[in-house]
């Protein structure tokens, strides 16, 4: 991924009135062109010259791609899903060869009725999307199918989908136990063989914002972390303000280095600032400390 370097700057003003300007970073879609002339040495950390400016790789920015961004854009999917592979045995329909052909009228009718039946069974599950028949075989009709579940991405999406899969198991077990043939007849839309119900496999969407954050941070992976705001994950360094992990540099500017975040303290007309958090002020004229 590449980062474009914006022209705008943000001014940090110390309490004494001096300023430090830092670029506002926007990671967006880059323009990729070839390296021109001998400008390639100007762009550090894998960035390249596009004829006008350095195009930087994430997580770098700056005129020469020498600075590290405070936050990296990570985009979790809007929705996450689970797929359950199930097998049920329908006893109220006798298997015929036409059911093998997914484009036959018979298959289409079976698919419609089966879908209607499953929509009734799973009607109380908000994550339920639908069913997809993958195979029909003899016995009366053994139905291999997928139950599809979907939910909005939240940090707890796995729990939500795990709970939904449990409810699916309970509901399909219940219906295949209750809707059974009596005297070779079925009074329900479909009847089942209780012992023919099996959950073959469950696949849940895998999305880990922490992993994505670490990958994009590359050699700074140990210093970037994920924090949530309104259930949305943010990949930030301690230099990003407004988060629990934000580093307070007081009279200074936070800068990332390969050893982590550090504060670069300012010097004003009246004070020198020092200390790990730039909170120790020394007055130039009187040479005394105050905190």
């Amino acid at each position: 991924p590449l980062a474009t370097i914006p022209v705008s700057t943000t001014s940090l003003t110390s309490s004494e009135g001096s300023t430090i300007s830092t670029p506002s970073v926007d990671i967006s879609t880059p323009v990729t062109t070839s390296i021109v002339g001998d400008q390639c040495s100007r762009c550090k950390n894998g960035g390249f010259w596009d004829g006008l400016k350095c195009q930087c790789l994430t997580p770098y920015y700056g005129e020469s791609c020498e600075e590290v961004v405070n936050s990296i854009d990570i985009a979790p999917p809007e929705t996450v899903s689970a797929q359950m592979e199930l097998t049920v045995t329908v006893t109220s329909v006798k298997f015929t060869d036409e059911l093998k052909n997914h484009s036959s009228q018979e298959f289409r009718e079976f698919n419609k009725t089966f879908t209607e039946q499953m929509n009734i069974v799973y009607s109380g599950i908000p994550e339920y999307v639908g069913v997809n028949i993958t195979n029909l075989r003899l016995g009366s009709v053994v139905v291999e199918h997928d139950v599809l579940l979907r939910t909005k991405y939240t940090p707890e999406y796995k729990t939500a989908l795990d709970n939904a899969t449990e409810v699916v198991k309970q509901k399909i077990t219940k219906v295949t136990t209750e809707q059974i043939m009596t005297n070779d007849n079925c009074s329900a839309l479909m009847c089942f063989n209780t012992t023919g119900t099996q959950v073959q496999n469950i696949t849940v969407t895998q999305y880990d914002p922490v992993e994505e954050c670490r990958q994009k941070a590359e050699e700074y992976e140990d210093y970037f972390l994920v924090e949530y705001r309104d259930q949305k994950p943010y990949c930030i360094s301690p230099c990003e303000s407004g988060f629990n992990a934000s580093k307070n540099c007081n009279h200074g500017k936070c800068q990332m280095s390969q050893n982590g975040a550090r504060c670069l303290c300012v010097t004003t007309e009246t004070h020198w600032y020092s200390g790990e958090d730039c909170n120790q002020g020394t007055q130039k004229s009187h040479h005394h400390h105050h905190h």
């Epitope: 015929t96 009228q105 009718e109 479909m190």
Partner: nanobody, 123 residues
Framework: EVQLVESGGGLVQPGGSLRLSCAAS????????MAWFRQAPGKEREGVAF???????SYAESVKGRFTISRDNAKNSLYLQMNSLRAEDTAVYYC?????????????????WGQGTMVTVSS
């Protein structure tokens, strides 16, 4: 397009007989399951009888021994012979079809329906 057309309904006295017919077209008649349903005024639709492609039949308890379902695959026709008719048999009778070999009289399992024919049993 599947089409089902019923005929043979009418007014009959208690104890009398009627024979309903259903002419089918638009599908391979010999392969599916055919059924008769009925709906009395103010009541739910109920299954009367069904017949599978191999001639297997099933009847509702209320009509067993009085009604006979049959099919003629050569004529693409379904029949319902109704004997010893009672006042409670008064209803609109519907012919229904499924392309599947069904063993159910649940109306929702049958996708194709005729318009119905009225049977009135009254003295």
């Amino acid at each position: 397009e599947v089409q089902l057309v019923e005929s043979g309904g009418g007014l009959v006295q208690p104890g009398g007989s009627l024979r309903l017919s259903c002419a089918a077209s638009g599908f391979t008649f010999s392969r599916g399951t055919m059924a008769w349903f009925r709906q009395a005024p103010g009541k739910e639709r109920e299954g009367v009888a069904f017949i599978n492609s191999d001639g297997r039949t099933s009847y509702a308890e209320s009509v067993k021994g009085r009604f006979t379902i049959s099919r003629d695959n050569a004529k693409n026709s379904l029949y319902l012979q109704m004997n010893s008719l009672r006042a409670e048999d008064t209803a609109v009778y519907y012919c229904a079809a499924s392309l599947l070999y069904l063993m159910t009289v649940n109306a929702a399992a049958y996708p194709y329906w005729g318009q119905g024919t009225m049977v009135t049993v009254s003295s």
